[in-house]
């Protein structure tokens, strides 16, 4: 069960913004389902961060499936969530303010804030560090600005543009975009274990991206996918390195985990990085 004892490495990444999803299902992999019909559908690809075509078999599958490119973009891309709020005196909040708190699938336990539509207030919650939805803010102020009704009858949209209710003028504001964990490892580390097509029962390991651990499974001896390793160490080496946390606009910290729980101080916020 020994893992490589690696240092935290600062790397830079100015190309990809944090992966922020309006809906958790946008992170599901394309699932053609068990039927064999041919239907052109679209899914959101978390690696390319774009809506792409895939062939759907006509039954089952999952929610990351849309009849048109436009519908996919509307549900899963950030641009469509960041609309300027209506210019009436009683302005509407962005749609994502009404999404329920979503800790996501990772285990980072980061303090974040979300707008609770029941209490009509921004409240604290524990965020796992990846995926989730856009009702997720680094600060209470940011959450209030965007989702709570302001005292002067205005709200701030997610680009940080204040809409003045009196004259409908747009005033730039500086609001921070929430920073999230990202997965920068090989894409197959996020695929499910696949036994394959043959009849053997070989002991193999696969990376379970939901629990963040390498787990054993029985491999049939042929077929399957690349999330298939002969040892736990090999699995960890290939897949555990992938979780990266952004610490500033240009910088990322690669959280290569050690076996003991360790405290990492990042951007004034203490979090626990747990062992995989």
């Amino acid at each position: 069960d020994s893992e490589e004892d690696e240092e935290h490495t600062i790397i830079t990444d100015t190309e990809l913004p944090p992966l922020k999803l309006m809906h958790s299902f946008c992170a599901f992999k394309a699932d053609d389902g068990p039927c064999k019909a041919i239907m052109k559908r679209f899914f959101f690809n978390i690696f390319t961060r774009q809506c792409e075509e895939f062939i759907y078999g006509g039954c089952e599958g999952n929610q990351n499936r849309f009849e048109s490119l436009e519908e996919c973009k509307k549900m899963c891309t950030r641009d469509n969530a960041n609309r300027i709020i209506k210019t009436t005196l009683q302005q509407e909040k962005p749609d994502f303010c009404f999404l329920e708190e979503d800790p996501g699938i990772c285990r980072g336990y980061i303090t974040r804030y979300f707008y609770n539509n029941q209490t009509k207030q921004c409240e604290r919650f524990k965020y796992g560090g990846c995926l989730g939805n856009m009702n997720n803010f680094e600060t209470l102020e940011e959450c209030k600005n965007i989702c709570e009704d302001g005292p002067n009858g205005f709200q701030v949209d997610n680009y940080g543009t204040q809409l003045n209710a009196v004259n409908n003028s747009l005033t730039p504001q500086s609001t921070k975009v929430p920073s999230l964990f990202e997965f920068h490892g090989p894409s197959w580390c996020l695929t499910p274990a696949d036994r394959g097509l043959c009849r053997a029962n070989e002991n193999r390991f696969y990376y379970n991206s939901v629990i963040g651990k390498c787990r054993p499974f029985k491999y049939s001896g042929c077929g399957g996918n690349e999330n298939n390793f002969t040892s736990k160490q090999e699995c960890l080496r290939a897949c555990k390195k992938g979780f990266i946390q952004r610490i500033s606009k240009g910088g990322l910290i690669k959280t290569k985990r050690k076996r003991k729980k360790q405290r990492v101080k990042i951007a004034y916020e203490e979090i626990f990085v747990k062992n995989m």
Epitope: G33, P34, C35, K36, A37, I38, M39, K40, I55, G57, G58, C59, E60
Partner: antibody
Framework: DVQLQESGPGLVKPSQSLSLTCTVS?????????WNWIRQFPGNKLEWMGY???????SYNPSLKSRISITRDTSKNQFFLQLNSVTTEDTATYYC????????WGQGTLVTVSA | QIVLSQSPALLSASPGEKVTMTCRAS?????MHWYQQKPGSSPKPWIY???NLASGVPARFSGSGSGTSYSLTITRVEAEDAATYYC?????????FGSGTKLEIK
């Protein structure tokens, strides 16, 4: 509304080729779905023969693979069935259908194989 | 290939009765699909992916099942339901049909 219409000769001689056309109106065959040929024998038994997908890929019933070809003409929004070396056993009503189990079928055309 | 066996071959029912017809597959399939065919007409998609009613199908029809055993049920049969019903699997090439259940209304 999507409509499919089969056309072709109603009588074919044994050992010749059977050729049928399915003309689709109200929907582009390059937009989506698989476009199927299905036949129904005189005793009412149904057999899926094959399809051509919106992208042009084909899939055939293995029992017919050596004799069947499904092609298309996208400019006319038509797809075609060619069945070679026919015998009297190929006498049937031939249907074209969009994505067999949830789409419209044509009204069918009876093809008799006889000398 | 997967063979689909339908039973009964002939089903006779009076209006208002509940009827069930079954379709058994020689190997497990992910879903079953059903068609209704009336004399002189082409088959119409009736129930797809085991339990989903096709457009225009009355709510008295339902489908269920899994693995190798599937069924189509009509809660209160009406005269217009007289037809032959075929099951079809779309899980394994070749995509096969059952031999049909003919429903007669007394």
């Amino acid at each position: 509304d999507v409509q499919l219409q089969e056309s072709g000769p109603g009588l074919v001689k044994p050992s010749q080729s059977l050729s049928l056309t399915c003309t689709v109106s109200g929907y582009s065959i390059t937009s989506d779905y698989a476009w199927n040929w299905i036949r129904q024998f005189p005793g009412n038994k149904l057999e899926w023969m094959g399809y051509i997908s919106y992208s042009g890929s084909t899939s055939y019933n293995p029992s017919l693979k050596s004799r069947i070809s499904i092609t298309r003409d996208t400019s006319k929004n038509q797809f075609f069935l060619q069945l070679n070396s026919v015998t009297t056993e190929d006498t049937a009503t031939y249907y074209c259908a969009r994505w067999a189990y949830d789409g419209p079928w044509g009204q069918g055309t009876l093809v008799t194989v006889s000398a | 290939q997967i063979v689909l066996s339908q039973s009964p071959a002939l089903l006779s029912a009076s209006p208002g009765e509940k009827v069930t017809m079954t379709c058994r597959a020689s190997s497990s399939v992910s879903h079953m699909h059903w068609y209704q065919q009336k004399p002189g007409s082409s088959p119409k998609p009736w129930i797809y992916a085991t339990s989903n009613l096709a457009s225009g199908v009355p709510a008295r029809f339902s489908g269920s099942g899994s693995g190798t055993s599937y069924s189509l049920t009509i809660t209160r049969v009406e005269a217009e339901d007289a037809a032959t019903y075929y099951c079809q699997q779309w899980s394994s090439n070749p995509f096969t049909f059952g031999s049909g259940t003919k429903l007669e209304i007394k």
